[in-house]
Every structure is written in structure tokens, then in C-alpha cells.
């Protein structure tokens, strides 16, 4: 069974930037790719990027950077300021689409113990 | 304009065979998933058979696994659908259709239709 | 497979109703539905995607809601030539699966 993969990490040097990466771990090859904050697109979450391997990438502030790093893993950095900026304990969601399998979604947070002056 | 156009249809005995065709023009077809749906006589739509833009997946109804086949030219901008030991079951109206990414894979276009008739 | 259950088969009402069709999922298919229209004599045509959202030109007393197992379909201020079939679809996981339809007649 198909799985996706989501990993929130805040950055060492702005507190509160962050970056998201999702991974899926299935057979299928990847149709689109949507991240949103605030829990799934549509179930009150709203979209921060969404990424088509051909058609290419359209992305929404806070995000600064989304990007392919493999055919079936994306990264999005988040900016760190303004009034929407992200905090600690905000809900990043991956939704990859796959056809025609279908869709496959999980979400993921800052883990709790994460201190960012660690992770330089 | 988007236009999708069935073709191949008609009267055909029990056990026999028919090869459907769909042209699309109006949009790059090589970029779009496609598929056929059948509308039975009770008016119920099903999905017989679905093929990514990239030719590697596949997707078939379980009643037509085995009998029917999807294919595409990419060149020809044309979709088929290659059914064999047709059966009663297998009467309905058949469409052709495209799948838009951004859409969550929602049907955007249909064609007109063509009509199977298996007869004994 | 998912099974998209869709309530009422029927309805009858007068021009300037407001209409609702609902569509109950068998699990959970996220927010990845669409909604169709079949006028008489002719093929299904997309009105609605990820639930809520209008395909061009549809007009916006059409309206869509839900997420998970339970959405809803709207028609505001019904008209004349909103007679048709109705069909809700899953596209969360294969097979996509429609909805049994609901045929709408006006008084």
C-alpha cells in the first residue's frame, strides 16, 4: 500500500522559518503534488503550493521555495515573518496524487522536542 | 476548443468484437490522462478503463479485465478501446473523457458518446 | 471499492427552489469529489471539482460542500433549465466511482 511521508524542520538561523518535506513511498508516478498548513486541503487547511511534474509550480506566501527533489519527493521553505508565518505547533499536509491510483495524504507537525539551535 | 470524438461503435453478436476510437484536439492530448466511461441503459456510469498521459498505467473495470484494452497514440491524438467476447452486460453508451490534474482528476471534458449493442 | 451512495433519486420542484442533493461515501475520499450534469440527449458535463469549486462558466447558484463522507450539492433559485440528472464521483482512490444520480424534473 502506497504511503506518504511528511517532515517539518525549523531552521537554525530564523526561528520561524521552516521547511516541509514529503516523500511517497508507492509505485505510481506522481500527478500532482498539493501542501497546505492548517490541516488538508479542504478540511479547513489552506494551500501553500502546489507542484505538476510538467506543468510546473505555483506556490502561495508564506512559502518562498517549492521544489521537486526527487519524482516522488518535495520540499517547500517557509518564510519566517509577517502576520502569517507559521508557528511552532502549525499542521503541514502532503497530498500526492498518483492516476490512476488515486491520492494518498498524511500531515506531520514540528516534533516536540525540536530545538533549533540544535539542528545547525 | 476542446472537442473529444467517439467513433466505432454499433450492432455486435454475443462473443464479438469492436474497437472504439476517441480524437481529441483543442489541447496538448499527450499531456492528459484519459479515460472511457460507459452509461448503461439504466443511466448508471461506470468507468470501464483508464490510461495515464504516460502510457505506463493502466486501470480496468473488473468485469472488462481480460477482454477489453486501453491504448493511445500520442502522435495521432487518438484514445482506443479494444473490447473482445463482448457480452449482454457490456450494452451501454460509451464515452470518452479527459482528466484535469488540477481538478483532483475530475472528468473536465466528455465526448458525445458512441453506442455498443451486444446482441445474441 | 468505494461506494458513492446519492439521495434522493428524484426530485420534483418549482422554478426559484432551492434544491439539495447529498452523497455519502463508504470511507473516507478526502475532498477529492466532483459533481456532474446530464441534460437529456446529452453527455455529463463537469460542474464542480474538489467538492466546491465551479468549472468555467458554471453559474454560481450551483455550490458544493463536504469533506470526508458526507457532501452536499446545491442548486439556489433552481431554473428551468437546471433539468437534468445529477452525478457525484470519487476520484480519491481507483476506480473512480459515480454516485446512482438524481434526476431533477421542474413543476
Known amino acids: 500500500t502506497p504511503e506518504v511521508w511528511v517532515q517539518v524542520r525549523m531552521e537554525a538561523t530564523e526561528l520561524s522559518s521552516f521547511t516541509i518535506r514529503c516523500g511517497f513511498l508507492g509505485s505510481g508516478s506522481i500527478s500532482l503534488v498539493t501542501v497546505s498548513w492548517g490541516g488538508p486541503n479542504g478540511a479547513g487547511g489552506t494551500t501553500l503550493a502546489v507542484l505538476h511534474p510538467e506543468r510546473g509550480i505555483r506556490q502561495w506566501a508564506p512559502a518562498r521555495q517549492a521544489r521537486w527533489e526527487t519524482q516522488s519527493s518535495i520540499s517547500l521553505i517557509l518564510e519566517g515573518s509577517g502576520a502569517s508565518s507559521p508557528c511552532a505547533n502549525t499542521t503541514f499536509c502532503c497530498k500526492f496524487a498518483s492516476f490512476p491510483e488515486g491520492s494518498w495524504e498524511a500531515c506531520g507537525s514540528l516534533p516536540p522536542s525540536s530545538d533549533p539551535g540544535l539542528s545547525a | 476548443d476542446v472537442k473529444l470524438v467517439e467513433s466505432g461503435g454499433g450492432l455486435v453478436k454475443l462473443g464479438g468484437s469492436l474497437k472504439l476510437s476517441c480524437a481529441a484536439s483543442?489541447?496538448?492530448?499527450?499531456?492528459?490522462?484519459m479515460s472511457w466511461v460507459r452509461q448503461t441503459p439504466e443511466k448508471r456510469l461506470e468507468l470501464v478503463a483508464a490510461i495515464n498521459s504516460n502510457v505506463i498505467s493502466t486501470y480496468y473495470l473488473d468485469t472488462v479485465k481480460g477482454r477489453f484494452t486501453i491504448s493511445r497514440d500520442n502522435a495521432k491524438n487518438t484514445l482506443y478501446l479494444q473490447m473482445s467476447s463482448l457480452k449482454s452486460e457490456d450494452t451501454a453508451l460509451y464515452y470518452c473523457?479527459?482528466?484535469?490534474?488540477?481538478?483532483?482528476?475530475?472528468?473536465?471534458?466528455w465526448g458525445q458518446g458512441t453506442s455498443v449493442t451486444v446482441s445474441s | 471499492s468505494i461506494v458513492m451512495t446519492q439521495t434522493p433519486k428524484f426530485l420534483l420542484v418549482s422554478a426559484g427552489d432551492r434544491v439539495t442533493i447529498t452523497c455519502k461515501a463508504s470511507?473516507?475520499?478526502?475532498?477529492?469529489v466532483a459533481w456532474y450534469q446530464q441534460k437529456p440527449g446529452q453527455s455529463p458535463k463537469l460542474l464542480m471539482y474538489y467538492v466546491s469549486n465551479r468549472f468555467t462558466g458554471v453559474p454560481d447558484r450551483f455550490t458544493g460542500s463536504g469533506y470526508g463522507t458526507d457532501f452536499t450539492f446545491t442548486i439556489n433559485t433552481v431554473q428551468a433549465e437546471d433539468l437534468a440528472v445529477y452525478f457525484c464521483?470519487?476520484?480519491?482512490?481507483?476506480?473512480?466511482?459515480f454516485g446512482g444520480g438524481t434526476k431533477l424534473e421542474i413543476k
Open positions: 470511507q473516507s475520499v478526502s475532498n477529492d
Open positions: 464521483q470519487q476520484a480519491y482512490r481507483s476506480p473512480w466511482t
Open positions: 483543442g489541447f496538448t492530448f499527450s499531456s492528459y490522462h
Open positions: 473523457a479527459r482528466h484535469e490534474d488540477y481538478y483532483g482528476f475530475a472528468m473536465d471534458y
